[in-house]
Amino acid sequence: QPPAACPAPCECSEAAKTVKCVNKNLTEVPPDLPPYVRNLFITGNRLGRLPAGALSAPRLAELGSLNLSGNHLRAVEAGALAALPALRQLDLGGNPLAELSPLAFGRASPLEELALRGALREQGALLGLADLLQAGALRNLSRLELADNGLLLLPTGMLGALPALRHLDLSNNSLVGLRNVSFQGLVRLQSLNLSDNSLGVLRNGTLAQWRGLPALRRISLSHNTWVCDCAIEDMVAWLKESDQVEGKEALSCAFPEKMAGRALLKLNTSELNCSAPVDVPSQLQTSYVFLGIVLALIGAIFLLVLYLNRKGIKKWMHNIRDACRDHMEGYHYRYEINADPRLTNLSSNSDV
């Protein structure tokens, strides 16, 4: 049969099963893409949004790799990527996404690699991705790139439904902690990139989760702002015995100032001001629990006093009601006098 036509502004190769529409100022996905396409590069254009049906089978039944980076995309709408039965790789990097619909991929997608480098700088897109992942639409995902997004925190439970995930890239963000991030479901995770963030310490809970991931062999923690106080003691101990961390010898303190530049692996307990055996967070936790108990007791006593004085309170309430009624009747009488023009003089000369 004759080879399929190539959309006017694009470059196509049937042998390479590839279509490239690069820097062509396109405002929409070409509707006449050839059916042989497995690799589709639509990059450096001005798409703005990706609506439902912009990319759809049956014509794109073979599409396996889709690069939509740098297209000024603001919205990926519901169903936009749902009808692509062979889609394995998707790159949405470099788009200022404001909306990423949780239904963008439909109910389930065969997608294995998702790159969102620099595409989640707006909260709406991040929350959309979290919903999308939690809904289980991307259960086949093995690589997730979330680098360069200025992320401070990850939404709770965001990584909970990714049983096939092997590589997670969170580098070059502003992550300050991982307390609300659960890694437990990531049983196949092999590499985790957390370099170039603002992490100050890794807590015991996180370290325990990482220890429990049998496949996790590569953790990158370089260029973070490690705070070398008592709270980092457990992390240092873990670093010394772990073979999971890449270039751990180069990890160094950022704070406090007197510790800046010191290698984490060379820190001693004596330098970390760990005089008290209980770490600060657990002391705080104990204080909060105690405070809670005191407040509960006060509340209980208050309710008990109210209960014991219920008759007196009832009598007091009746008195207040009667007083209010007398007061209101006085107002009512004065209002009626003022309203009758014949009684105006009386009203002004009398003290009702």
């Epitope: 049969q1 080879p3 470059e11 196509c12 190769s13 049937e14 042998a15 390479a16 099963k17 590839t18 490239k20 042989y36 497995r38 690799n39 396996g64 790799s65 062979a86 394995r88 790789q89």
Partner: antibody, heavy 125, light 107 residues
């Protein structure tokens, strides 16, 4: 290891037919697109024909259109080239060559990445 | 059909020389070009794809460049095992077509 072994070549008279076979081992044949390429004595390479992994797409060079037919039997891991109405100018070494694209591959196209050792076809009266 | 023209058709060079082979397409083929090496009585071997990407296992002295209609294969320092015939091939569209070949011989 990955291997392509051509057979079926020989001397044949003009106007006659010949069927070449290419037996495949070491990879999942049913997932790969395949080609036949030939080389006339002392000359360069000439692409002859292509077939997709499932046989749904076939392309031929103008010089063999209507005379040569490519086919495959995925259950037997074998590629075929049926050559009819042979001419003297069809005399060449015929190579089967695997396309780097497999059914599940969606990265770069590496060209024809695995070649057989070739089988010689001589068309002479 | 797209015609591929290679030059020179043959050249003589010494071990250690820098060798450049050019290939011209009769119409624009973007970067859809491959280079093959063939030694006498042997099957061709893929060297370069997408005009400039080195096939896995191929020595780094081989490099490719070009886009559109003009392409170049360069061997930075010729080695004894590099004496062979080199072919370019376009895969922009069917029918696939090869250049006429460049034979690199020992001076």
């Amino acid at each position: 290891q990955v291997q392509l072994v051509e057979s079926g070549g020989g001397v044949v008279q003009p106007g006659r037919s010949l069927r070449l076979s290419c037996a495949v081992s070491g990879f999942t044949f049913s997932s790969y697109d395949m080609n036949w390429v030939r080389q006339a004595p002392g000359k360069g390479l000439e692409w002859v024909t292509f077939i997709s992994y499932d046989g749904s797409n076939k392309y031929n060079a103008d010089s063999v259109k209507g005379r040569f037919t490519i086919s495959r039997d995925n259950s037997k891991n074998t590629l075929y080239l049926q050559m009819n109405s042979l001419r003297a100018e069809d005399t060449a070494v015929y190579y089967c060559a695997r396309d780097s694209y497999s059914r599940s591959w969606y990265g770069d196209y590496y060209g024809m990445d695995v070649w057989g050792q070739g089988t010689t076809v001589t068309v002479s009266s | 059909d797209i015609q591929m023209t290679q030059s020179p058709s043959s050249l003589s060079a010494s071990v250690g020389d820098r060798v450049t082979i050019t290939c011209r397409a009769s119409q624009g083929i973007s970067s859809w070009l491959a280079w093959y090496q063939q030694k006498p009585e042997k099957a061709p071997k893929s060297l370069i794809y997408a005009a400039s990407s080195l096939q896995s296992g191929v020595p780094s002295r081989f490099s490719g460049s070009g886009s559109g209609t003009d392409f170049t294969l360069t061997i930075s320092s010729l080695q004894p095992e590099d004496f062979a015939t080199y072919y370019c091939q376009q895969y922009n569209s069917y029918p696939l077509t090869f250049g006429g070949g460049t034979k690199v011989e020992i001076k």
